[in-house]
Amino acid sequence: HNTTVFQGVEGQSLQVSCPYDSMKHWGRRKAWCRQLGEKGPCQRVVSTHNLWLLSFLRRRNGSTAITDDTLGGTLTITLRNLQPHDAGFYQCQSLHGSEADTLRKVLVEVLADPLDHRDAGDLWVPGESESFEDAHVEHSISRSLLEGEIPFPPTS
């Protein structure tokens, strides 16, 4: 699987879409998981409704929601109030028994103005007062990467 990059602005909502063959995955529940390390397990974040026929109903775990268009073959994950710690590698999965097929590998990038993450006293240029928080949904930007093209950031 190639990795698809989805970019969302910090504080906004990011929609990740995972297309799949609706016939091949007929009757299967879906899940969104976070990859823990390059070779580590994929930790389940949220999965679709226990009853496959109700997969269109939005299920939520914290700030992450999932819904499945089983006829159209599109799994949609929404990350609300995107934060820097949301950045990283994820997978969309199709579940069958205790097994899981990968539908798409995803890299979430959280966008912010580079000055946002300096302490107020760290701005070399005079700081302006922060403005209102708006809540519109960020229409995600996505692009494909070759497998392994972006390494995991080093841990400190």
Epitope: V9, G11, A87, D116, R118, D122, F132, P153
Partner: antibody, heavy 114, light 112 residues
């Protein structure tokens, strides 16, 4: 006084490697996202790499033109950033600047030629 | 990639007269904090770029107040109220929100 001083540029053959350094002082380096930007002779500015702070797990980002060949890193204890450049191509010939976006170094020249 | 388009690419100016440079981005640069991540730089001949305006309209430290920045989420303008001889060089707009970060092609300002 804020200072950013690049070094490590020079002449290298295609396929070769170079490591650029950027020593900084005069600002709280560890909190600042740092970048490398290059400029070919007579051309415009091209952003090529970016490294975030420790609080962001030193996340790195690259322009497609250098991805897989260049590696940005930082040493907060030395307030220095680096750019390891491998598999160099003639089109990598440029002046390389390090920057925190508000202040810039004077640049170091990299020439890739046989 | 976000495309930054500047106009004009060359701008002959008369000292003491106003001057204006436009920059358009192919997508909005407005963040959730109401900040617009648009920056303006001046690169004087033989020098490194220097920051003039950050976040669309904020004057960087040490920059004369004859410079000002304005705009919306996608259309931006750098204005010089009264051009001085030291203002010659290449002006670049840049977006630092979406990866990869991108610069405009540059506008060369020279004295008539």
């Amino acid at each position: 006084e804020v200072q950013l001083v690049e070094s490590g540029g020079g002449l290298v053959q295609p396929g070769g490697s170079l490591k650029l350094s950027c020593a900084t002082s005069g600002f709280p380096f560890s909190n600042v996202w740092m970048h490398w930007v290059r400029q070919a002779s007579g051309k415009g500015l091209e952003w090529i790499a970016h490294i975030k702070a420790k609080s962001d797990n030193y996340a790195t980002y690259y322009a497609e033109s250098v991805k897989g060949r260049f590696t940005i890193s930082r040493d907060d204890s030395k307030t220095t950033i680096y750019l390891q450049m491998n598999s160099l191509k003639t089109e990598d010939t440029a002046v390389y600047y390090c920057t925190g976006l508000d202040y810039w170094g004077q640049g170091t020249t990299v020439t890739v030629s046989s | 990639d976000v495309v930054m388009t500047q106009s004009p690419l060359s701008l002959p100016v008369t000292p003491g007269e106003p001057a204006s440079i436009s920059c358009r981005s192919s997508r909005s640069l407005l963040t959730s904090k109401g900040i617009t991540s648009l920056y303006w730089y001046l690169q004087k001949p033989g020098q490194s770029p220097q920051l003039l305006i950050y976040r669309m309209s904020n004057l960087a430290s040490g920059v004369p107040d004859r410079f000002s920045g304005s705009g919306s989420g996608t259309d931006f303008t750098l204005k010089i109220s009264r051009v001085e001889a030291e203002d010659v060089g290449v002006y670049y707009c840049a977006q630092f929100l979406v990866y990869p970060y991108t610069f405009g092609q540059g506008t060369k300002v020279e004295i008539k």
